[in-house]
Amino acid sequence: AMHVAQPAVVLASSRGIASFVCEYASPGKATEVRVTVLRQADSQVTEVCAATYMMGNELTFLDDSICTGTSSGNQVNLTIQGLRAMDTGLYICKVELMYPPPYYLGIGNGTQIYVIDPEPCPDSDF
């Protein structure tokens, strides 16, 4: 299995945005790579987003995806937006080398993303 490294913990911003780097130990230069972010919470695993990219090109997530990202060599910089406290959980980076063959799969240990909902602003008399 291909080694995938990602940070253990990330704290989302007050605007509900979390970014982390997913690095994979590629055996060479895959021309087509698929990156999937999985969320594990309460022993349930769900797919958050996925993108396939050609080496040297940008990651393209679906238009309605909460993820964006960029790639550089064997690193993928992932950003997840619109997070709320209930989205706190372990976010796992899965990398697949799709082409050329053979197929390689790597799954990271996960990044624990903590999301704290901002305190509502008190009403102002001004």
């Epitope: 590629s26 055996p27 060479g28 230069k29 060599g73 064997n74 050329p100 063959p101 053979p102």
Partner: antibody
Framework: QVQLQESGPGLVKPSETLSLTCTVT?????????WNWIRQPAGKGLEWIGY???????YYNPSLKSRVTISRDTSKNQFSLKLSSVTAADTAVYFC???????????WGQGTTLTVSS | DIQMTQSPSSLSASVGDRVTITCRAS??????VAWYQQKPGKAPKPLIY???YRYSGVPSRFSGSGSGTDFTLTISSLQPEDFATYFC?????????FGAGTKLELK
């Protein structure tokens, strides 16, 4: 376990064509990866010669391109090197090796010594 | 072609020593660098790939670091079986190229 094994004549005369074969066991050369030839003159460094891909594609080192052909026999799971117009400078240990596309070499043959001499 | 300049070309050390071998690429190769160990009459064996990842079965005393143009192989505590020749290799760009090698000898 993947294994690669080179075979060849050992001695070739100057101006003749060198022919070497690499037999692969434990993995089909058409399933994936790139299948390479690398050489090493005595006491010197390694020089990549070229590859044949799982799909039959080739790429050769520009420094040797005019003299090199790498082909395969999929029925025998073998790939071969032909190097034409050899000179004493082609005397070396020749290795076959496997890599992912533009990747490091994870499996190697044990090498076969090729001497160019009249 | 990308030149891989390896230094030193030879090195004398003792069992237990910490040893560092360096490799400089003539242009940026990212993290696409591997290191191999070769003993006389044998094929090279992969030690490190993708700059810093140990190949399967390679002892933890071997480590790699660097990026861009400067790369290092470190052996933290030399063992008797480590006396051999070491090569760096860039696989960022074809034609694939190797360093000239570092011969590690017993002092």
């Amino acid at each position: 376990q993947v294994q690669l094994q080179e075979s060849g004549p050992g001695l070739v005369k100057p101006s003749e064509t060198l022919s070497l074969t690499c037999t692969v066991t434990g993995y089909s050369i058409t399933s994936g990866y790139y299948w390479n030839w690398i050489r090493q003159p005595a006491g010197k460094g390694l020089e990549w010669i070229g590859y044949i891909g799982y799909d039959g594609s080739n790429y050769y080192n520009p420094s040797l391109k005019s003299r090199v052909t790498i082909s395969r026999d999929t029925s025998k799971n073998q790939f071969s090197l032909k190097l034409s117009s050899v000179t004493a400078a082609d005397t070396a240990v020749y290795f076959c090796a496997r890599n992912y596309y533009s990747g490091y070499f994870d499996f190697w043959g044990q090498g076969t010594t090729l001497t160019v001499s009249s | 072609d990308i030149q891989m300049t390896q230094s030193p070309s030879s090195l004398s050390a003792s069992v237990g020593d910490r040893v560092t071998i360096t490799c400089r690429a003539s242009q940026n190769v990212g993290t696409y660098v591997a290191w191999y160990q070769q003993k006389p009459g044998k094929a090279p064996k992969p030690l490190i790939y993708s700059t810093s990842y140990r190949y399967s079965g390679v002892p933890s005393r071997f480590s790699g670091s660097g990026s861009g143009t400067d790369f290092t192989l470190t052996i933290s505590s030399l063992q008797p079986e480590d006396f051999a020749t070491y090569f760096c290799h860039q696989y960022d760009t074809y034609p694939l190229t190797f360093g000239a090698g570092t011969k590690l000898e017993l002092k």
